[in-house]
């Protein structure tokens, strides 16, 4: 016999919530795998660019995205399938996963705050290497997409450490409309914008983390309530 009343409402709420979560994970995983396995990117992984080493931070970032996407899909599936099947085992596993993820988020938050300068440096390196790829291999659409995302999200273009060729390519092709890399090279420096994000706008990252944490707690409560509801309904 299935759950009834308010518990049934929780069941479908949990299903919808985790289906969206599973879809989001799928999108992240799909994009990350495209970035990783696109032939242009794969070729560049083994390439020495003159006297400059091949990009590596770019791939670390991609592997993190793959992991995040996979975990999201897995947890989303547990919540989604566990709710619709009214499986105490799956919901229990889902709850355990959420507890672990919550602990990881808290740990990552503390570590991130302590190492924010290093993270900012890595993000800048990630941007530089994506930019390097977009310039060196003009068919590397994945790298171009990453650069475009940086430029549009942070409303910046290039950095004060650009090579001559990168400056020229950016000036003609990759700056957001309305920005002029030559006159605004230092005003709209992406390195500066990244630094600003990790110092002056750190509260934004904090708010995002709190929102994620609240959602997790909310899901944990819902899964426990549903689990108890299933147990009670199976008794009668």
């Amino acid at each position: 016999m299935g759950v009834e009343g308010c518990t049934k409402c929780i069941k479908y709420l949990l299903f919808v919530f985790n289906f969206v979560f599973w879809l989001a994970g799928g999108v992240i995983l799909g994009v990350a795998l495209w970035l990783r396995h696109d032939p242009q990117t794969t070729n560049l992984l083994y390439l020495e660019l003159g006297d400059k080493p091949a990009p590596n931070t770019f791939y670390v970032g991609i592997y993190i995205l793959i992991a995040v996407g996979a975990v999201m899909m897995f947890v989303g599936f547990l919540g989604c399938y566990g709710a619709i099947q009214e499986s105490q085992c799956l919901l229990g596993t889902f709850f355990t996963c959420l507890v672990i993820l919550f602990a990881c988020e808290v740990a990552a938050g503390i570590w991130g705050f302590v190492n924010k300068d290093q993270i900012a440096k890595d993000v800048k390196q990630f941007y530089d290497q994506a930019l390097q790829q977009a310039v060196v291999d003009d068919d590397a659409n994945n790298a171009k997409a990453v650069v475009k995302t940086f430029h549009e999200t942070l409303d910046c273009c290039g950095s004060s450490t650009l090579t001559a060729l990168t400056t020229s390519v950016l000036k003609n092709n990759a700056c957001p409309s309305g920005s002029n890399i030559i006159s605004n090279l230092f005003k709209e420096d992406c390195h500066q914008k990244i630094d600003d994000l990790f110092s002056g706008k750190l509260y934004l990252i904090g708010i995002a983390a709190i929102v994620v944490a609240v959602i997790m707690i909310f899901e944990m409560i819902l899964s426990m309530v549903l689990c108890c509801g299933i147990r009670n309904s199976s008794v009668y």
Partner: antibody
Amino acid sequence: EVQLLESGGGLVQPGGSLRLSCAASGFTFSSNYMSWVRQAPGKGPEWVSYISSSSTYTDYADSVKGRFTISRDNSKNTLYLQMNSLRAEDTAVYYCARYSYGRDNFDYWGQGTLVTVSS
Amino acid sequence: QSVLTQPSSASGTPGQRVTISCTGSTSNIGAGYDTHWYQQLPGTAPKLLIYGNSNRPSGVPDRFSGSKSGTSASLAVSGLRSEDEAEYYCQSYDTNLSGWVFGGGTKLTVLG
């Protein structure tokens, strides 16, 4: 060994057109940015244009913008420069040069081809 | 008039050390763009001599060295030899002109 061999230069009247070619060998042509650099008699070199490996990106010096067009054929390992509306000040030796991204400069140059614009 | 200013000539006797300067501005050398040096022997194409301000490509003798400070760069040739007699050009990128720029060249003469 990297080799770049220009051809197509010669005497042309003002307002005329000319197409320069550059045959490349000794390196992976399709993976490299290529450039044209010219040198007027008794003067220093002057950058003219560049083209990216798959022809996505191109740029020109202000002095030739709208008149010159750079292109490439990766299947033939050849770089081209189509020069229209030629002026007396375009008289120079035109060099084809490989652009090194790693070094951010012109690391190999051809022997050059002379273009003379005169009536 | 070139964007990068070089002395038109320089000279020295064999074994001597000669320095060639290249003066730019805040839109090229001073903007952080690398300076490169080319050697052009009579009747030949320019050949890369120094890249990235101070690096030598393989095959270039260590008698040639480069440096950069502020808005200018310099090329030093120590232990001068007769085969060093050539035209030397500096090169950088200029943000105002949105292109690569060269110096007017310095004719190095080895005396005696």
